[in-house]
Structure formats: C-alpha cells, structure tokens
C-alpha cells in the first residue's frame, strides 16, 4: 500500500536535485580559486541535513547554520548588488562588471538559484511531488528559509555604497514583501553602509518618467532614512544601452543619460 504523502500547493523538488547541487558546487569551486578548499560532499551533506526528515513547514535558520558555516565566503563588502524582481538583468550586469556581486554570484546563492527542494517529516526521502508554497501553505519552508538566511547574511556583510536594481515596470517598484524589502533592507548595517543607491530599470523605450518619484520609492527612501543610511536613486531609461556602456565605457554615446 503506498504511504500517504502530504500534498502541498507548490511544485516539488527540482528533479536531480542532489546531483545538481553537487555539480554546481564542483563547478563553482573550480572557477573560484578562493573557494577551492571547499569539500562539496560535505556541503551537500550539510544542505541535505537542513531539510531531510524535517517537517517542511517547520524549518528554521538554525537548520541551515552548518551549511552557512561551510559556505562562508568573503566578498568585497563595497561591491554588492542587490536586486528585486529583475534578476536576469542584475546577473547580466555582474557578468560584465566582474568585480560586483549579487547573492547568486556567491557559492550558496549559486547552488540554490532557481531550485526547489523539500523533504518529509520522519523519512529520509526528498519530496519530488510537491513542496509548500510560501503564501498558500507556510512561510517556514526549506526554500524560503534558505533565501531568508543567505539574504540576511549577504545584506549584513555589505558596506560603503550598496546598489539595488529595481524593476520599474512593476506596479510596486519597491515591494515591502519581497526578499529585498522584507529582509535585506532591514539588515543593512548603518555603521557600515553609507548609501543605498537604487537603480530603477525602465521597461518601455519611450518611458521618460522619473520613476525615482514613484510612491513606493519614496517608501523605500523613508525606511532607509529612518535607519540613518543615505539614499540615492537613478533612472536607467535604457537597460540595453546601460549594459553596453558597462561593457564599453569609452563609447562616445555613453556620456549621455542612460
């Protein structure tokens, strides 16, 4: 008789999840010499230990501490790029501007990017059928708690001028409920971070509005200012040109506003 299995509202664990995590770890440590000391089998064991045999609605940050310890990585604290609802452009940017880092350019972020995972209480099985949805089921699920944990640490590590890329095409350019709005903003350290500089990315080619005046950006400004961190905002009217100018800053067309 097949054992009864909890049905969740979200998609199940990404297929070949263990193999994917291990392969990504090996690839990352080969590309980044400063992380060559990392034992990827131990990393996988710690990752697995965070959620296997545990109820997928009862995961804590503490469960991920062994993985956090193994994945400890120093990034230049003044070269951090946060993003919200515009991951692809943020990643394209750091692929060109190699000295800047998104969370997904770190080992732990790279391992988990775009993956889903969860286990089942009291069994060593990975659940490939369904996993808890943050809204419909529970917020303390393995994926959400992982991203909350690594995002908090990433924000806490930042210093000097921190940049955040925001999607100007969305109704809420700054969303208090996003990982950036609910975790990262509140974990920037005022003693270390001088300025949060928001880059608002425009969607339409003919969109010349000043989206830095958007009410949600004013809300972000207020939150940041209350934490005694300076705030600045720039419109990126032409994201394609913006990337091109990051690649070729000497280009004569790159002196004008982008």
């Amino acid at each position: 008789v097949p054992r009864w299995r909890q049905q969740w509202s979200g998609p199940g664990t990404t297929k070949r999840f263990p193999e994917t995590v291990l392969a990504r770890c090996v690839k990352y440590t080969e590309i980044h010499p400063e992380m060559r000391h990392v034992d990827c089998q131990s990393v996988w064991d710690a990752f697995k230990g965070a959620f296997i045999s545990k109820h997928p609605c009862n995961i804590t940050e503490e469960d991920y501490q062994p993985l956090m310890k193994l994945g400890t990585q120093t990034v230049p604290c003044n070269k951090i790029l946060l993003w919200s609802r515009i991951k692809d452009l943020a990643h394209q940017f750091t692929q060109v501007q190699r000295d800047m880092f998104t969370l997904e350019d770190t080992l732990l972020g790279y391992l988990a990017d775009d993956l889903t995972w969860c286990g089942e209480f009291n069994t060593s099985k990975i659940n490939y059928q369904s996993c808890p949805d943050w809204r419909k089921d529970c917020s303390n699920n393995p994926v959400s708690v992982f991203w909350k944990t690594v995002s908090r640490r990433f924000a806490e590590a930042a210093c000097d001028v921190v940049h955040v890329m925001l999607n100007g095409s969305r109704s809420k350019i700054f969303d208090k409920n996003s990982t950036f709005g609910s975790v990262e903003v509140h974990n920037l350290q005022p003693e270390k971070v001088q300025t949060l500089e928001a880059w608002v990315i425009h969607g339409g080619r003919e969109d010349s509005r000043d989206l830095c005046q958007d009410p949600t950006i004013k809300e972000l400004e207020s939150i940041i200012s209350k934490r005694n961190i300076q705030f600045s905002c720039k419109n990126i009217y032409r994201p394609d040109k913006f990337l091109q100018c990051v690649k070729n800053p000497e280009d004569s067309s790159c002196t004008s506003e982008i």
């Epitope: 400890t72 990585q73 120093t74 990034v75 230049p76 604290c77 640490r153 806490e156 590590a157 210093c159 000097d160 350290q189 003693e191 270390k192 971070v193 001088q194 300025t195 500089e197 200012s225 005694n228 961190i229 300076q230 705030f231 600045s232």
Partner: antibody, heavy 116, light 111 residues
Framework: QVQLVQSGSELKKPGASVKVSCKAS????????MNWVRQAPGQGLEWMGW????????TYADDFKGRFVFSLDTSVSTAYLQISSLKAEDTAVYYC?????????WGQGTLVTVSS | DIVLTQSPASLAVSPGQRATITCRTS??????????MHWYQQKPGQPPKLLIY???NLESGVPARFSGSGSGTDFTLTINPVEANDTANYYC?????????FGQGTKVEIK
C-alpha cells in the same frame, strides 16, 4: 574631482561661539555623509561624529554631545560645525571628511584658537 | 569603545629599508571576512591622507610601497622601501563599531 574646502582660521575668546564651514564640490553632497574630526595641537585624531546629508540627522561621539552642532545647507553644498561656549581645550584643527568609515577625502582643516 | 594601540610610538628608518608599524585593537574589527581597519599618513600642516582601507586595499594613487595586512585584532602597515618623503605621522583607524576610533599615531623619520 571631489574637493572639500573649509573656512579660514578663527581666533575666539572663551565663552564665544564659532561656526566652521565645509563646502563640497565634485559630487552631490547628499549622496555621502560628512564626518568631523578634531586634532588638538601636537595630538592625534578624534572622530567627533557625522551628519547624514540626506536627512540632516547628526550623530555625535560621546565626548562631543552638547556644545557641538553639525548642520547643512544643501543649496550651497555646505556642511557646518558650530561650537558654542568655547573653552581653551577646544583649541584644535577641525577637519571635515567624507565617507562613513574610512575617509578618502578631507578638507584642509580649520584652526580654531580659543584664548583670552 | 574600541581602543587602538600603535607601536612603536616612533621609528627612524634609512632610505631603502623596510618600516613596519603595528596596530592592535581591544576587540576584533572583522565583520563577515572584511576587516574594518584603515591607515592614514599625515605630514605637518596637512590633513591626513588615506593609504590603506579595509586592512589591505591600497587607495588609488598611493604607491605600492605601502601595504597593509592583518585581521581580527592585529594589523600591520609596511613601507618597503622607505623613501625620504615618507617622513610623517601614521595613524590606524577602525570603523567596525561606532564610535570610530584612531590609534595614537606613529612618527616615522628617515635617517
């Protein structure tokens, strides 16, 4: 390029007040906080605190709470340090410096001498 | 407050030699692998000049003769080789914890 230009030397009597200015150019004043650092004659450097140039909110080190006031006039890209009820021990060079933790840009310094 | 203790208080070095200044802090100034320790040079009548930020990063325009190292509570500024115009006071400073604090300074003289 970034420049911080401070007002000239001041000779004041005990009990008087002084206002030192620091004019920023080459960048937007409101993007970076302004720090103030004191150096008494022949002595080392003391961080007095900083002002958030975006909100105008000052933060003072414990030894500089009370008679010391940081302020701004963003319309002329200038930060100010005002010292009231001057004492002989306030005699020092006062520097403005940009950045929160490490100071890449400094004003040339303003010597404030307090003497009767 | 974090107390910074520099040693020696003064040193005299011949041109071409190595000068080493140490700065010890009363508690760690590290955060997430970054050390919030900075070094300045001050010549008479001039403001301090940033040499090294976050323990080992050379400020742009500063000669590569200057280098910084260390983590936690023990930090070193090295000048190698020393040149005649390196005569100055050198200060360490931490920004890991408010209030920011400076060392008492080290006077470097060239023989």
């Amino acid at each position: 390029q970034v420049q911080l230009v401070q007002s000239g030397s001041e000779l004041k009597k005990p009990g008087a007040s002084v206002k030192v200015s620091c004019k920023a150019s080459g960048y937007n004043l409101t993007n970076y906080g302004m720090n103030w650092v004191r150096q008494a004659p022949g002595q080392g450097l003391e961080w007095m605190g900083w002002i958030n140039t975006y909100t105008g909110e000052p933060t003072y080190a414990d030894d500089f709470k009370g008679r010391f006031v940081f302020s701004l006039d963003t319309s002329v890209s200038t930060a100010y340090l005002q010292i009231s009820s001057l004492k002989a021990e306030d005699t020092a060079v006062y520097y403005c410096a940009r950045y929160p933790g490490w100071f890449a840009y400094w004003g040339q310094g303003t010597l404030v001498t307090v003497s009767s | 407050d974090i107390v910074l203790t520099q040693s020696p208080a003064s040193l005299a070095v011949s041109p071409g030699q190595r000068a080493t200044i140490t700065c010890r802090t009363s508690e760690s100034v590290d955060s997430y692998g970054n050390s919030f320790m900075h070094w300045y040079q001050q010549k008479p009548g001039q403001p301090p000049k940033l040499l090294i930020y976050r323990a080992s990063n050379l400020e742009s325009g500063v000669p590569a003769r200057f280098s910084g190292s260390g983590s936690g509570t023990d930090f070193t500024l090295t000048i190698n080789p020393v040149e005649a115009n390196d005569t100055a006071n050198y200060y360490c400073q931490q920004s890991n914890e408010d209030p920011w604090t400076f060392g008492q300074g080290t006077k470097v003289e060239i023989k």
